[in-house]
Interface confidence: low
């Protein structure tokens, strides 16, 4: 015996008060699948959240988030503040960087500067609470009679431009 | 607040009919089921039928399906129950309780106060 | 119509005690299950629905499971107010039908 719920087409529900027809989804909700004996309220992007994506009978709203606040969780179950470069985001709010910590983006937290010495190089370039130390030849590699070496390229973070 | 108020305590002769009402208020009436509960004194619970007052569609549990009437007057936000050919057995408190638009996600979240409707000679 | 076969009718147990109530159907109704608590006197209250699905505001120290044909209700450590009248509900299928209810008592 066939469920006759599984003629139900997505946006519809099969509505067993009404004999197990096949009902539209009624407004701010959806059904993503056929067979569906209800349907699902639509995501509402209140607050920090904004409307990325609209729902429609078939597919849920999609959220993202006010400038200041960035996505955090599967399909940005949360909003977190953003924080400036140099700061992380501490139970109190953004704070700075400690010494010898860095984080050159608008989210996440201070970590540490790259330990050039146990690379056998040196720093090059002195870290900051924005960016990391820029690690330079070994020492050796500094010794008079070497050869010159052309210093690298300032470190830059993936899809960025040179500043 | 979402509050069910129903229709004070009735007495009836056997044979006679019974109409309930249950007033709505705090919510959009006319987006929930209506549902018609009855408890006999000391028994069990028993589903008599259900409304939806947007349009009237009505489900009934076989065994009231002669002799129960469920109505809506969206105006007033109300819901009522008529049972007629009352006997000695229909002695009991009739609730009536919503459910939202999703069968089969419902939820009977708030309730009457119940009436008391007491058949006897 | 779908019958609902409720065990034990009722139950003594004294307060902090785990209490389980489980309630069979005649026939496969997935997980479409609610469970009901009654005071005297009160309209029954909505505790589960969906089998497993705990009511908001209700206690964390009720819980349902089961689907198919067999359902529990535990209340992990029994309180002073959890004394009432317990009532499973069916809703796969028309007409809802409800267990004849489980009285809990204190020992």
């Known amino acids: 015996l066939q469920d006759p719920c599984s003629n139900c087409p997505a946006g519809t529900f099969c509505d067993n008060n009404r004999n197990q027809i096949c009902s539209p989804c009624p407004p701010n909700s959806f059904s993503s699948a056929g067979g569906q004996r209800t349907c699902d309220i639509c995501r509402q992007c209140k607050g920090v959240f904004r409307t990325r994506k609209e729902c429609s009978s078939t597919s849920n709203a999609e959220c993202d988030c006010t400038p200041g606040f960035h996505c955090l969780g599967a399909g940005c179950s949360m909003c977190e503040q953003d924080c400036k470069q140099g700061q992380e985001l501490t139970k109190k709010g953004c704070k700075d960087c400690c010494f010898g910590t860095f984080n050159d983006q608008k989210r996440g937290i201070c970590r540490p500067w790259t330990n050039c010495s146990l690379d056998g190089k040196s720093v090059l370039v002195n870290g900051t609470k924005e960016r990391d130390v820029v690690c330079g030849p070994s020492p050796a590699d500094l010794s008079p009679g070497a050869s010159s070496v052309t210093p690298p390229a300032p470190a830059r973070e993936p899809g960025h431009s040179p500043q | 607040q979402v509050q069910l108020v129903q229709s004070g305590a009735e007495v009836k002769k056997p044979g006679s009919s019974v109409k309930l009402s249950c007033k709505a208020s705090?919510?959009?009436?006319?987006?929930?089921?209506i549902n018609w509960v009855r408890q006999a004194p000391g028994q069990g619970l028993e589903w008599i039928g259900n409304?939806?007052?947007?349009?009237?569609?009505?489900n009934y549990n076989q065994k009231f399906k002669d002799r129960a009437t469920l109505t809506v007057d969206k105006s007033t936000s109300t819901a009522y129950m008529e049972l007629s050919s009352l006997r000695s057995e229909d002695t009991a408190v009739y609730y009536c309780?919503?459910?939202?638009?999703?069968?089969?996600?419902?939820?009977?979240?708030?309730w009457g106060q119940g009436t008391l409707v007491t058949v006897s000679s | 119509d779908i019958q609902m076969t409720q065990s034990p009718s009722s139950l003594s147990a004294s307060l902090g005690e785990r209490v389980t109530i489980t309630c069979k159907a005649s026939?496969?109704?997935?997980?479409?299950l609610s469970w009901f608590q009654q005071k005297p006197g009160k309209a029954p209250k909505t505790l589960i629905y969906?089998?497993?699905r705990l009511v908001d505001g209700v206690p964390s120290r009720f819980s349902g499971s089961g689907s198919g044909q067999d359902f529990t209700l535990t209340i992990s450590s029994l309180q002073p107010e959890d004394i009432a009248t317990y009532y499973c509900?069916?809703?796969?299928?028309?007409?809802?039908?409800f267990g004849g209810g489980t009285k809990v008592e204190i020992k």
């Open positions: 309780t919503r459910t939202w638009e999703f069968y089969y996600d419902s939820v009977f979240d708030y």
């Open positions: 705090g919510y959009t009436f006319s987006s929930y089921w």
């Open positions: 409304i939806y007052p947007s349009d009237s569609y009505t």
């Open positions: 026939q496969d109704i997935n997980s479409y």
């Open positions: 969906r089998a497993n």
């Open positions: 509900l069916q809703y796969d299928e028309l007409p809802p039908t």
